[in-house]
């Protein structure tokens, strides 16, 4: 089965006496190892005696190898898949067919590859694009169908003879495929490479020179031109004539057209190499140029700059900036079209002329009020003076100056009126447009800067107003002093510190938070009666009696305001006990008869305790003691006590009558 | 080890016939190619006819063709050589051989290359 047997190496292999040949090999025997290797040279089959005629160049059998040229031929591969080759050297002779007889366990093969060695190196190739073209990047490939790793060689890259600058990449390539040496060498031609001769040599590991391939490089590029002028300066008065010639000094492809541009614009009926200009104008100031084009492009010639004399143009004046803010800087600018240019320059403000001044700027560095106006200026050059122009305005702005707040009322101002401001100032630029108001309220403007404040409030302290253009100019605030009565009037306990107990020596305080004018009179009130005319209520030692609701007023002269009722709350222990009965102190006995402890306490009893006639206290803690039925032993005098969380008290004793029913008498 | 017997030669008149058979013994490739050679004495060794196991090819040289034929059992592992209208030149020791194919970029030999394996030979001689 032939398709067992896959091989892969070069068709071909190129070599040159004394260099060396590798051969690149792969194989795959599918029915197993590598018994045996021959390598013919020249192998020639022979029909009659069914053996191959040729030199045996390599013997390797299972019996082992058998030297012939064994140094010189190497098998470098193996019993299954490496088929490589190495003759070192090689000889002129050893071109043709080198024959790879192949035995495995089942088969035999011959595998052919063709040897060229030629007597002396063979030169590289070198290829070109299809079309280089000036400027634009190109690869130089110089390719030579050779590499062996036994024999080190280098390409070299000249241009006219000498090694070219440029960093060359080579590559080597020694694989089943291919086997080749290639040196990459990216190069940008210029015009003047056009015709060059590029040349890549091949030389030895040590520079010795082999081989080599050149060309002639064939550089596209527009028209190369160079441009003369008569005068050659290019500087000439009006009226006079100027000639123009353009000449190619190179083109590849020839030319095709010629033309003259000024300022990059074609100039038309302009189509030889000579442009002649006759009693020429200023208006014929300008770069000239000449272009010629071919199939590439279009070429231009370096730009010649005619300048054609003439005095100075009425001028005009450019103001950087106008209008301009107050402060900051400003520059005027002279424009007068001249040629040459200007050399003194005169300025004018309001046509009154500018001493020292003449420059083609002036530069102010602070712009006041007073520098607004009319500038205008004459230019100066050699051919003689300009006329004055219609000159620029500058308006200088700033923002209103001497702003003041102004209160229109008598004073003083009492709480409640009606007030109005009115915002003043002395100069504006532009226009003021607008007022503004600290602070901000809900208040009316009837007009523009004036402000109206209806039922003025006791805190309106100041006032301040700005006047607005581009910028707002902001007045001193104005006080506005308004008058009131006192405020926050409020009763404050200064001592004890803790609650009020009968006994207590006590003081109040008439508290207010404000009062304008601050001097103040104190009234001290309980039940609509005056109890004094000091800030302060003083009690050496308070009893119940004193307790209740009380006011203090503080008056100015613009009114009086009253405090809340403060409640004063005095404390003390249960007293005037007393114990009353019900139905009466008399009862009879069966039925119902009610004890009630009553007392006067602050805070009200909390533990009521019975005592009877042997002062023995009884099983009972609430106010009202109850005996039902009541018997004719509970016969006695009573007593109660009372405690809360000041102290207790007691009740003097009250005598309770238990007597006989009738049932009771009629039966004894 | 691969073992070749020959058999079937002897004297013959000019214009006879004879038939030899080898018979390979040691040889275990399905697929092989068997031939016969001659040796007269002070000649090379020359093919007289081959066959292949696997297709039936035959090979026969120009100076045998139309005379003689060869003819194969491969499961005997056994070739024939029937030898009609025999010439004095015919006279030499005929050999068998057996090989493995013998592959030349694709394309076979019918013939053994190089004799791979071949038997003691068997002697044709032809006179009258």
């Known amino acids: 089965d032939s398709s067992k047997w896959v091989f892969e190496h070069p068709e071909t292999l190129y070599a040159w006496e004394g260099a060396c040949v590798w051969i690149p090999c792969t194989y795959r025997a599918l029915d197993g190892d590598l018994e045996s290797f021959i390598l013919f040279h020249n192998p020639e089959y022979n029909k009659n005696t069914s053996k191959f005629d040729g030199t045996r160049l390599y013997e390797s059998t299972k019996d082992g190898k058998v030297p012939s040229e064994q140094k010189r031929v190497q098998f470098l591969g193996d019993k299954n898949k490496n088929c490589t080759l190495s003759i070192h050297p090689v000889h002129l002779n050893d071109s043709g067919q080198l024959g790879l007889r192949m035995e495995s366990k089942t088969e035999k093969w011959m595998e052919r590859i063709h040897l060229n060695v030629s007597e002396r190196p063979f030169p590289p190739h070198i290829q070109l694009p299809p079309e280089i073209q000036e400027s634009q990047e190109v690869t130089l490939t110089c390719l030579l169908n050779f590499s062996c790793y036994g024999y080190p060689i280098q390409l070299q890259w000249l241009l006219e003879g000498v090694p070219m600058r440029q960093a060359a990449v080579t590559s080597t390539s020694l694989t089943i495929k291919s086997v080749f040496t290639r040196s990459e060498l990216k190069f940008s031609p210029q015009w003047s490479h056009h015709g060059k001769i590029v040349t890549c040599q091949l030389q030895d590991a040590d520079g010795k020179f082999l081989s080599n391939d050149t060309v002639q490089l064939n550089v596209k590029h527009t028209p190369k031109l160079e441009i003369k002028v008569t005068p050659s300066d290019a500087i000439v008065r009006e009226g006079d004539s100027v000639t123009m010639t353009c000449e190619v000094s190179s083109s590849n492809p020839e030319y095709t057209t010629v033309s003259w541009l000024k300022d990059g614009t074609s100039l038309k009926k302009q189509n030889t190499f000579t442009l002649n200009l006759r009693e020429v104008t200023k208006d014929q100031s300008g770069k000239y140029c000449c272009q010629v084009s071919n199939d590439v492009g279009p070429g231009r010639s370096e730009e010649v700059f005619l300048q054609v004399q003439y005095a100075p143009e009425p001028s005009t004046v450019q103001i950087l900036h106008s209008p301009a803010v107050e402060g900051s800087q400003v520059e005027f600018l002279c424009m007068s079209l001249a040629n040459p240019l200007p050399t003194n320059y005169t300025w004018y403000h309001n046509g009154k002329e500018m001493q020292g001044r003449t420059e083609e700027k002036v530069h102010i560095p602070k712009i006041l009020p007073w520098h607004a106006g009319t500038y205008s200026c004459v230019a100066e050059n050699i051919l003689g003076t300009g006329q004055r122009g219609p000159g620029a305005e500058l308006d200088v702005q700033y923002p209103p100056k001497k702003v003041t707040t102004v209160i229109q009322n008598p004073m003083p101002i009492r709480e409640g009126d009606t007030v109005t401001l009115s915002c003043n100032y002395n100069s504006s630029n532009p226009s003021v447009t607008r007022y503004e108001w600290k602070p901000h309220g809900a208040w009316e403007e009837p007009s523009l800067g004036v402000l109206k404040i209806q039922n003025v409030g006791w805190d309106n302290t100041t006032i301040a107003c700005a006047a607005c253009n581009s910028w707002c100019s902001w007045a001193s605030p104005v006080a506005l002093n308004v008058q009131y009565a006192p405020r926050d009037v409020r009763v404050r306990k200064i001592k004890p510190l803790s609650e009020i107990h009968s006994g207590n020596s006590v003081s109040l305080q008439c508290d207010f938070s404000s009062s304008h004018p601050k001097e103040v009179q104190f009234f001290w009130e309980k039940n609509g009666r005056l109890l004094g005319k000091e800030s302060q209520l003083n009690f050496d030692s308070i009893s119940p009696e004193d307790a209740g609701s009380y006011s203090c007023w503080v008056n100015n002269s613009i009114g009086q305001t009253a405090s809340k009722a403060w409640t004063l709350e005095v404390l003390y222990a249960p007293r005037r006990l007393r114990v009353s009965m019900s139905p009466g102190d008399q009862v009879m006995e069966g039925k119902s008869a009610t004890l009630t402890c009553e007392s006067d306490a602050n805070p009200p009893v909390s533990h009521y305790t019975w005592f009877d006639w042997n002062n023995q206290s009884l099983p009972y803690h609430s106010q009202k003691l109850r005996l039902e039925p009541v018997k004719v032993q509970h016969s006695g005098a009573y007593w109660c006590q009372g405690t809360n969380s000041v102290g207790k008290g007691r009740s003097p004793l009250s005598t309770l009558t238990v007597y006989y029913s009738p049932e009771t008498i009629g039966r004894r | 080890q691969v073992q070749l017997v020959e058999s079937g030669g002897g004297l013959v008149q000019p214009g006879g016939s004879l038939r030899l058979s080898c018979t390979v013994s040691?040889?275990?490739?399905?697929?092989?190619?068997m031939g016969w050679f001659r040796q007269a004495p002070g000649k090379e060794r020359e093919v007289v006819s081959c066959?292949?196991?696997?297709?039936?090819?035959?090979y026969y040289p120009d100076s045998v063709k139309g005379r003689f034929t060869i003819s194969r059992d491969n499961a005997k592992k056994t070739v024939y050589l029937q030898m009609n209208a025999l010439k004095p030149e015919d006279t030499a020791i005929y050999y068998c051989?057996?090989?493995?194919?013998?592959?030349?970029?694709?394309?076979?030999?019918?013939?053994?290359?190089?004799?791979?394996?071949w038997g003691q030979g068997t002697q044709v001689t032809v006179s009258s």
């Open positions: 051989a057996v090989d493995k194919p013998f592959y030349d970029g694709g394309s076979y030999y019918t013939c053994p290359v190089d004799f791979g394996s």
């Open positions: 040691g040889f275990s490739l399905d697929y092989y190619v």
């Open positions: 066959i292949s196991s696997s297709d039936g090819a035959t």
